[in-house]
Interface confidence: low
Amino acid sequence: APRGTQAEESPFVGNPGNITGARGLTGTLRCQLQVQGEPPEVHWLRDGQILELADSTQTQVPLGEDEQDDWIVVSQLRITSLQLSDTGQYQCLVFLGHQTFVSQPGYVGLEGLPYFLEEPEDRTVAANTPFNLSCQAQGPPEPVDLLWLQDAVPLATAPGHGPQRSLHVPGLNKTSSFSCEAHNAKGVTTSRTATITVLPQQPRNLHLVSRQPTELEVAWTPGLSGIYPLTHCTLQAVLSDDGMGIQAGEPDPPEEPLTSQASVPPHQLRLGSLHPHTPYHIRVACTSSQGPSSWTHWLPVETPEGVPLGPPENISATRNGSQAFVHWQEPRAPLQGTLLGYRLAYQGQDTPEVLMDIGLRQEVTLELQGDGSVSNLTVCVAAYTAAGDGPWSLPVPLEAWRPGQAQPVHQLVKEPSTPAFSWPWW
């Protein structure tokens, strides 16, 4: 470990000089010190903080033959391509024994054309909608005055007279370019040119015009689109199952949406091929030659219930004396809603029709009058939802039941060769 110098005696005999110049300059700062005994490692500080990744070299030369004699140590810090981040106060620091020594400071400064800290960025804005652009530049030398330009035309009579760091634009009706000039005593620097693309405003008042079990008719009010006419609007619909979690402003649907395009005008669209009695979320965006508007918020809608599309399946009807036992299964065809129950009708050859509401049961025992004297008795069954009755089954004749015989089953719906749905096995 370093033995250190005599108390209170600074080891520094040469301190960092000053460097001032334009960006890109290369320069070197040096510290020289004389110590007794093993030379210490020289650390470089910039503004009091150690530079961990400094491009520094250290040269050590003994002044005598004895290890305990004095040494001259020269540390050189190279600054390549001077940048704003390099500016500040530079010092060298060494630890000797129980003391800490800091060199006198040298300063690195920057002076030249204005340097942009922030430039206007390309962006899209809705037509006639206010927005702000930012531009920030600094020297040295200060002051730096800004001049904004729109489509290459200055927005003020002279630098520093108009808006400075932030330009407020009350709205645009056509795609425009913006840039800013930074002026100081050394000259002028021009920022990048930002293109502000004017898109249509978000459509408003998306609403339902009419509803049917498998289709919805929707309409909306288009927003302003500047000088660019709307070319079309796009409507998205997505199933909104309970677990889906679409929020009012959620930007993307959690599953692939059903997308339809509408020619405009009119600002209206019929969405077909939907599931009955199903909640959806819909949204709309309109497009001009400049691009699409933002989407509206998701609007929750629901298709109404329909009636079942087919009759109950596998109806069997058997008779035993004055009783008839009728059994059936739920329709295979879509219910188009919530099944509320079944209606059953039976009729003899010369007797009036009897209509019964069975509820959600799938079997019923009928008490027949006249101990079987009613001839050619037939039974029909239909399923119903809140929207009404589905189609009735074909009439099923009542068959006499003989012990030991299986109950006859009347297959009223022909099985498709390939199942329409593939159900999992539990």
Epitope: E8, D47, G48, Q49, I50, Q99, T100, V102, Q104
Partner: antibody, heavy 120, light 107 residues
Framework: EVQLVQSGAEVKKPGATVKISCKVS????????MNWIRQPPGKGLEWIGL????????SYNQKFKGRVTISADKSISTAYLQWSSLKASDTAMYYC?????????????WGQGTLVTVSS | DIQMTQSPSSLSASVGDRVTITCKAS??????VAWYQQKPGQAPRLLIY???TRHTGVPSRFSGSGSGTEFTLTISSLQPDDFATYYC?????????FGQGTKVEIK
């Protein structure tokens, strides 16, 4: 905003040990040094020592060496001053102070002070 | 250790007066001297460092000068808020040392 908040006043008997804390916020705790200074009632300022929290390196005033320990806990941005074998003459206001960026030996932000009273 | 000798130890002055406080180092400390202001019941406040650089937010009526061993703090026009005790400090090498203080009182 740089803030240095010190622990509360202490009353100790001669020979005892006291440990006071200084919690900092508003700047990088490890990027600077923390100095400790004391001021006996009605008297001037006396430098005790410093610590560089990034590496735990310390420098002490030889006058107090052996009785003083300066430490830091980077995880909670807190510096500590521990003083043992207290004497009545150690009664003073003890300050922590942040080392200035242009010199570690400059104190640009100070804590509110912790009064340590040593009395039998 | 470096000794910092401050004078005067106290002075009386009126609002608007020009006030000068001096500090002498026992050895060459280059320009590594700072000045602090302390009011009763408060922690010291940094005014000047590197002999002549004003700290952030310090009014321009405070100025410092000197190098080597002799240093001066000047208050060009004393204000009511300036009545306090002033300390010099060398920030050249450890152990850091302070002057004994100068109390500026209202005449």
């Amino acid at each position: 905003e740089v803030q240095l908040v010190q622990s509360g006043a202490e009353v100790k008997k001669p020979g005892a040990t006291v440990k006071i804390s200084c919690k900092v916020s508003g700047y990088s705790f490890t990027g600077h040094t923390m100095n400790w200074i004391r001021q006996p009632p009605g008297k001037g300022l006396e430098w005790i020592g410093l610590i560089k929290p990034s590496n735990g390196g310390t420098s002490y005033n030889q006058k107090f060496k052996g009785r003083v320990t300066i430490s830091a806990d980077k995880s909670i941005s807190t510096a500590y001053l521990q003083w043992s074998s207290l004497k009545a003459s150690d009664t003073a206001m003890y300050y922590c102070a942040h080392g200035h960026y242009e010199s570690y030996f400059l104190m640009d932000y100070w804590g509110q002070g912790t009064l340590v009273t040593v009395s039998s | 250790d470096i000794q910092m000798t401050q004078s005067p130890s106290s002075l009386s002055a009126s609002v608007g007066d020009r006030v000068t406080i001096t500090c002498k180092a026992s050895q060459d400390v280059s320009s590594a001297v700072a000045w602090y202001q302390q009011k009763p019941g408060q922690a010291p406040r940094l005014l000047i460092y590197w002999a002549s650089t004003r700290h952030t937010g310090v009014p321009s009526r405070f100025s410092g000068s000197g190098s080597g061993t002799e240093f001066t703090l000047t208050i060009s026009s004393l204000q009511p808020d300036d009545f306090a005790t002033y300390y010099c400090q060398e920030h050249f090498s450890t152990p850091l040392t302070f002057g004994q203080g100068t109390k500026v009182e209202i005449k």
